[in-house]
Interface confidence: medium
């Protein structure tokens, strides 16, 4: 019969012959012959291959370097790579999460709109009229000015986006 020029899915052509690819999690040891099947071996402890393949070496699992602020989010298997994420308080600089940067703090006058995650930075918003934030923080939202009226007091000093109002006693009219 004519030697094949193309092979089925999960096969590869070698020496005019179709051999089975190795399944994910295994590497190629030797090609098939007229008389033997493809020989594959499982990847080692810290290795993986995530596709049907004819690789003779497995890939090393990604190392989540703590010196770069990284930690393991999902441990790798023989078929999947390790997934890294950042320590709490940090976020990835790229989708591949190869290093981390510190979550930014929101300055006084700004509050946290959305707390940072492992992949996104803190989102700050200016404190609107009636709200304030007097600290630099990655956690603190804008908070409403104190309501002097509910305490039966009057506003002695107006609030700003960075300071609360100052309440004081009402002036009693003398008879």
């Amino acid at each position: 019969p004519e030697p094949p020029t193309a092979c089925r899915e999960k096969q590869y052509l070698i020496n005019s012959q179709c051999c089975s690819l190795c399944q994910p999690g295994q590497k190629l040891v030797s090609d098939c012959t007229e008389f033997t099947e493809t020989e594959c071996l499982p990847c080692g402890e810290s290795e993986f291959l995530d596709t049907w393949n004819r690789e003779t070496h497995c890939h090393q699992h990604k190392y989540c370097d703590p010196n770069l602020g990284l930690r393991v989010q999902q441990k790798g298997t023989s078929e999947t790579d390790t997934i890294c994420t950042c320590e709490e308080g940090w976020h990835c600089t790229s989708e591949a999460c190869e290093s981390c940067v510190l979550h930014r703090s929101c300055s006084p006058g700004f509050g946290v709109k959305q707390i940072a995650t492992g992949v996104s930075d803190t989102i700050c918003e200016p404190c609107p009229v009636g709200f304030f934030s007097n600290v630099s923080s990655a956690f603190e939202k804008c908070h409403p000015w104190t309501s002097c009226e509910t305490k039966d007091l009057v506003v002695q000093q107006a609030g700003t986006n960075k300071t609360d109002v100052v309440c004081g006693p009402q002036d009693r009219l003398r008879a």
Epitope: G69, G89, H103, F139, K141, H143
Partner: nanobody, 117 residues
């Protein structure tokens, strides 16, 4: 020099409670974000809870939400973690930490919490 000293750990039965304290010095505590993290035996660090400088805004890991409460007393430069309904999986060394503008946070030496019957 930043110093953080945790206390309050110990052995407690499942369902029990503990209150951890963290005495802070060497920095302006009332202006600082603070957090608790923990490390279970043979595991990596796990964030537990964070609190804003004024103590108005608090955040919790899903694993402790509704059971743990973070608080602070800025007049005493002290951070607290009230832990209720403790489970075996809460067994860990608990650290208070001050987020830093460098790669590593400032940490205390930790206090061991063991939940066992």
């Amino acid at each position: 020099e930043v110093q953080l000293l945790e206390s309050g750990g110990g052995l407690v039965q499942p369902g029990g409670s503990l209150r951890l304290s963290c005495a802070a010095s060497g920095f302006t505590f009332p202006e600082s974000d603070m957090k608790w993290v923990r490390q279970a035996p043979g595991k990596g660090l796990e964030w537990v809870s964070s609190i804003s400088p004024n103590g108005w805004d608090t955040y919790y890991a899903d694993s402790v939400k509704g059971r743990f409460t973070i608080s602070r007393d800025n007049s005493k430069n002290t951070l607290y973690l009230q832990m209720n309904s403790l489970r075996a999986e809460d067994t860990a060394v608990y650290y208070c930490a001050k987020p830093a503008q460098v790669l590593f946070d400032y940490w205390g030496q930790g206090t061991l919490v063991t939940v066992s019957s």
